[in-house]
């Protein structure tokens, strides 16, 4: 006798207004009496519609929450599992049931903002900037909303960057406990003459940090050949262990690059009689603290003040 189990009921994908953080929820299946004591588990697969791969989770819950790109539609499917100890050693699963979430097609794509760029400066404040849509009327203006886990609801930008009295960016500071989690942004627009297509962005703040450049550079030469370069980590909230550095060393007309996770470096001079010995450095958040990052500007150049003559110490 084949053992069967029903799929969950009322599977749906809901948008609670958190700019891409959606709820996938369902109700338990109708279960026949002999399985009433069994634990039901649900296999949930979901993806943005343009994605090749499904994300799969198993849960005993009746809701699952995750972030999506709301520029594209979403589809999900779910089935019930009965584990083997309940079914005399055979794995039993229901048929799949499906649900989808369609994006709003209000406003043409040409009205959507272009070139959205966000940088988290020195892990302290976020600046996002954009350009207006390709074909918009002159009365069009844009509004930015953001949300991350920990906020009760989506918030609107309170400090816009403006050009010709139009919002072209936003500066956000005091983003408490906002890193290492998805940060959702929606930029929508308004015009009296046409609807404006919303634009959605999601990232994690620690991956878009642009630090300040290193400071207090110092260079010294020991034994007339050993170069020692030192610098200080820039001020601010980024822990020293989170930096990686790129150094450019210039000896007369020759330049070369080096890299380190420390804030000093030793190397040998290429030529004993070189007259010009300089370096400058930039930094970025390293792989131990983020998956990605933006290089700081280069520091000021620092040069060795010593003498290179045969009698120098």
């Amino acid at each position: 006798l084949e053992i069967k189990v029903n799929p969950p009921q009322d599977f749906e994908i809901l948008d609670p207004g958190l700019l891409g953080y959606l709820y996938l929820q369902w109700k338990p299946p109708v279960v026949i009496e002999k399985f009433k004591g069994c634990t039901l588990e649900y296999e949930l697969k979901y993806r943005n519609v343009d994605s090749d791969s499904w994300k799969t989770i198993i849960t005993r819950n009746l809701i699952y929450k995750d972030g999506f790109d709301l520029n594209k539609g979403i589809e999900g499917k779910i089935r019930t599992h009965l584990s083997e100890h309940c079914t005399n050693g055979s794995e039993v699963q229901s048929p799949w049931i499906e649900a989808s979430y369609g994006i709003s097609d209000e406003g043409s794509l040409e009205t959507k903002i272009q070139d959205m760029k966000c940088i988290y400066y020195n892990w302290q404040y976020l600046v996002c900037s954009w350009k207006p849509g390709k074909t918009v009327y002159s009365d069009t203006n844009y509004t930015m909303f953001f949300w991350y886990e920990g906020l009760d609801h989506a918030l609107q930008c309170a400090d816009y960057l403006q050009h010709d009295e139009k919002n072209v960016g936003c500066k956000l500071s005091n983003l408490d406990s906002s890193d290492y989690k998805d940060f959702f942004i929606c930029v929508n627009g308004s015009s009296k003459l046409e609807p404006i297509r919303s634009s959605y962005t999601v990232f994690q703040l620690q991956n878009i940090v642009k630090p300040l450049p290193p400071e207090f550079l110092h260079i010294s030469v020991e034994n007339s050949i050993d170069i020692r370069m030192k610098w200080s980590t820039p001020g601010g909230p980024i822990p020293p262990r989170c930096y990686t550095y790129e150094i450019v060393i210039r000896e007369d007309d020759i330049s070369w690059e080096s890299a380190t996770d420390k804030n000093d470096m030793k190397l040998k001079r290429r030529a004993n009689e070189s007259e010009d010995l300089c370096f400058f450095v930039r930094c970025k958040v390293n792989i131990y603290c983020a998956d990605d990052g933006i290089w700081s500007e280069w520091s000021e150049e620092e040069c060795w003040e010593g003498y290179t003559g045969p009698d120098s110490k």
Epitope: I57, S83, E91
Partner: antibody
């Protein structure tokens, strides 16, 4: 009496491969999901991978996805973990564990004694 | 992923003391929580499953309670054999299965 006996650990260079085995006895192996849990020296427990009973659906932690492969041979009552592209951070004691009940994971009611994997040059 | 946070990290107690360890989940996990005991150089041992069910062979001085996001492991009268590290684990949703960071119970 339920017994889980791991083998296959050892010293391997970064980028190398190892295959861990876990021989199970004392229960109907195919009826239960199984898993691998590891513990780096002086650290806590970290779930690595799980596999369901007879169908063999597999699940992985992000830290090992694409590098490790869990499998089972129900005819031999054996669980495997093929570990490729090993990194220093994979150094740990690897435990094989039986799921008390559940599709691909759950509470682990029996554990092996563990096998040490050291990744170092 | 569901994060599990245990407190305290270390607990100093004496034989006969009543000991309580707390585990907090970052989202509701219903009652899908297990507690383990681990001694140095040994594999973990299941004490409690489904938040409050005592595993066979485990002394009745161990008990578990809680549901949703807050859970507690209680040892009613600490015995010399109970000095160990204790871990909670959620199995509501995976991958990944997640463990708490551990609570070391040491002699005062």
């Amino acid at each position: 009496e339920v017994q889980l006996l791991e083998s296959g650990g050892g010293l391997v260079q970064p980028g190398g491969s190892l295959r861990l085995s876990c021989a199970a006895s004392g229960f109907t192996f195919r009826k239960y999901a199984m898993g691998w849990v590891r513990q780096a020296p002086g650290k806590g427990l970290e779930w690595v991978s799980g596999i369901s009973g007879s169908v063999g659906s597999t699940y992985y932690a992000d830290s090992v996805k694409g590098r490790f492969t869990i499998s089972r041979d129900n005819s031999k009552n054996t669980l495997y973990l093929q570990m490729n592209s090993l990194r220093a951070e994979d150094t740990a004691v690897y435990y094989c564990a039986k799921v008390r009940y559940g599709w691909g994971a759950g509470a682990f009611d029996y554990w092996g004694q563990g096998t040490l994997v050291t990744v170092s040059s | 992923d569901i994060q599990m946070t245990q407190s305290p990290s270390t607990l100093s107690a004496s034989v006969g003391d009543r000991v309580t360890i707390t585990c907090r989940a970052s989202q509701s996990i219903s009652s899908w929580l297990a507690w383990y005991q681990q001694k140095p150089g040994k594999a973990p041992k299941l004490l409690i499953y489904d938040a409050s069910s005592l595993e066979s062979g485990v002394p009745s001085r161990f008990s578990g309670s809680g549901s949703g996001t807050e859970f507690t492991l209680t040892i009613s009268s600490l015995q010399p054999d109970d000095f160990a590290t204790y871990y909670c684990q959620q199995y509501d949703t995976y991958p990944p299965i997640t463990f708490g960071q551990g609570t070391k119970v040491e002699i005062k």
